[in-house]
């Protein structure tokens, strides 16, 4: 969590950003609010970027300005704008590019004063991952797949019943560049498996953490997965 | 209102170098990009550069590349050009004005003479 | 890059008659994204900066009598001076800011006949 403080002349105002992750191809959001004004008309919201020469993106007087929209984000943001008498200033980023990846400001100016909060905007890819029993194989055998990630992630294999076990010895992990030549797809293949245990297939990297567990036994399987970001900071 | 105050005009010495000098008041300067545009005697309009003052990021004209430096001084409001190796072609009126693209405020220009 | 190129180079009109400028764009301005044109055009008088005239090829800068319009779409764009007054003697320009560097038509000249 970041929050910034007004610069000189009228009266300060907080502003509020938190650091997030944007996943590839997807819509993202970059957060940001502020203490609110009783009328739209005397807010304006500035989205600038380190290494960007106009702006990300600019609401003012209830409505979007464009003018002075810099040529990477055309078509590309909005803000809330309902919410934004209540003082969000969150930006929507749509079709999220890596080179989004950098340093935010979100800059407020409003009756009351003006404030600004920088947040860092990572990009990459990350998906859920999905483990399988592969039947093809000729010892038991367990398959982890996880469609796009970026960059490259690390994959450990875990187990339930013998916890703080290496893995690395009997697994062997791939990627497969995805047509559009930036993510990449992980697939993961653990041997010598036994039953009535638990596996988890971790893939991480610097933006996110996945875990697909697995839980074999004779009489049926069960799968869980869920996905957490790394680097949610506010500030 | 917007104003933008440049700095006065210069006669300078081929091959040496000139820096001009934007000050900017009534709006929140560090909001909006600077640009450089000039325009020789009788001419048209010509791009330099522009400078993104809340975090310095400069893009410069191809031409005018590793000739020119674009920079702002926050605390004062100010944008700068400097441009060296000066030649007879450098001739002209120098404006800065508030944007990046479509330019509503201007500076009052300042003429740069190149001459021995 | 994009360049610019404006016709005539120079037009002298008569008072309270027509005058038009048109510009050509070496590639679209139109954007998708939004269906505006980042097309603007400038006034410049002896001695003085430019002063913006009309923005996204239509919309007139607040301030500027209405005798002053803008049309055309893409890659075409004409300013149009409806009926010329003596105080519109100047030199005008057309301006592409979809994309850097930002680039000017060479001018249009516009006097009295």
């Known amino acids: 969590l970041i929050i910034g403080f007004g610069i000189s002349g009228r009266h300060s105002i907080t502003v509020t950003t938190v650091a997030s992750a944007g996943n590839i191809g997807e819509d993202g959001i970059l957060s940001c609010t502020f203490e609110p004004d009783i009328k739209l008309s005397d807010i304006v919201i500035q989205w600038l970027k380190e290494g960007v020469l106009g702006l990300v993106h600019e609401f003012k007087e209830g409505k979007d300005e464009l003018s002075e929209q810099d040529e990477m984000f055309r078509g590309r943001t909005a803000v809330f704008a309902d919410q934004v008498i209540v003082g969000n200033a969150s930006l929507r980023l749509k079709n999220v590019q890596l080179t989004d990846a950098g340093t935010y400001k979100c800059y407020i100016i409003t009756s009351k004063g003006k404030g600004n909060a920088n947040l860092e905007y990572k990009t990459g890819a990350f998906s859920m991952p999905e483990v399988n029993v592969d039947y093809n194989a000729s010892s038991e055998t367990l398959r982890c797949e996880a469609p796009r990630w970026f960059p490259q992630p690390t994959v450990v294999w875990a187990s339930q019943v013998d916890q703080g076990a290496n893995f690395s010895e009997v697994s062997n992990t791939s990627f497969e560049l995805n047509s559009e030549n930036v993510t990449m797809k992980v697939v993961s293949v653990l041997y010598n498996v036994t039953i009535n245990n638990t596996y988890s297939c971790m893939i991480e990297n610097d933006i996110a953490k996945a875990t697909g567990d697995i839980k074999v036994t004779e009489s049926e399987i069960k799968r869980r997965s869920h996905l957490q970001l790394l680097n949610s900071k506010a500030s | 209102q917007v104003q933008l105050v440049q700095s006065g005009a210069e006669v300078k010495k081929p091959g040496s170098s000139v820096k001009v000098s934007c000050k900017a008041s009534?709006?929140?300067?560090?909001?909006?990009?600077i640009t450089w545009v000039r325009q020789a005697p009788g001419q048209g309009l010509e791009w330099i550069g522009g400078?993104?003052?809340?975090?310095?990021?400069?893009k410069y004209a191809q031409k005018f590349q590793g000739r020119v430096t674009i920079t702002a001084d926050e605390s004062t409001s100010t944008a700068y050009m400097e441009l060296s190796s000066l030649r007879s072609e450098d001739t002209a009126v120098y404006y800065c004005?508030?944007?990046?693209?479509?330019?509503?405020?201007w500076g009052q220009g300042t003429l740069v003479t190149v001459s021995s | 890059d994009i360049v610019m190129t404006q016709s005539p180079d120079s037009l002298a009109v008569s008072l309270g008659e027509r005058a038009t400028i048109n510009c050509k764009s070496s590639q679209s301005v139109l954007s998708s994204s939004n269906n505006k044109n980042y097309l603007a055009w400038y006034q410049q008088k002896p001695g003085q900066p430019p002063k913006l005239l009309i923005y996204w090829a239509s919309t007139r800068e607040s301030g500027v009598p209405d005798r002053f319009s803008g049309s055309g779409s893409g890659t075409d764009f004409t300013l149009t001076i409806s009926s010329l007054q003596a105080e519109d003697v100047a030199v005008y320009y057309c301006q592409q800011y979809y994309s850097t560097p930002l680039a000017f038509g060479q001018g249009t000249k516009v006097e009295i006949k």
């Open positions: 400078i993104n003052p809340i975090f310095g990021t400069a």
């Open positions: 004005a508030k944007g990046q693209a479509l330019i509503q405020h």
């Open positions: 009534g709006y929140s300067f560090i909001s909006y990009a």
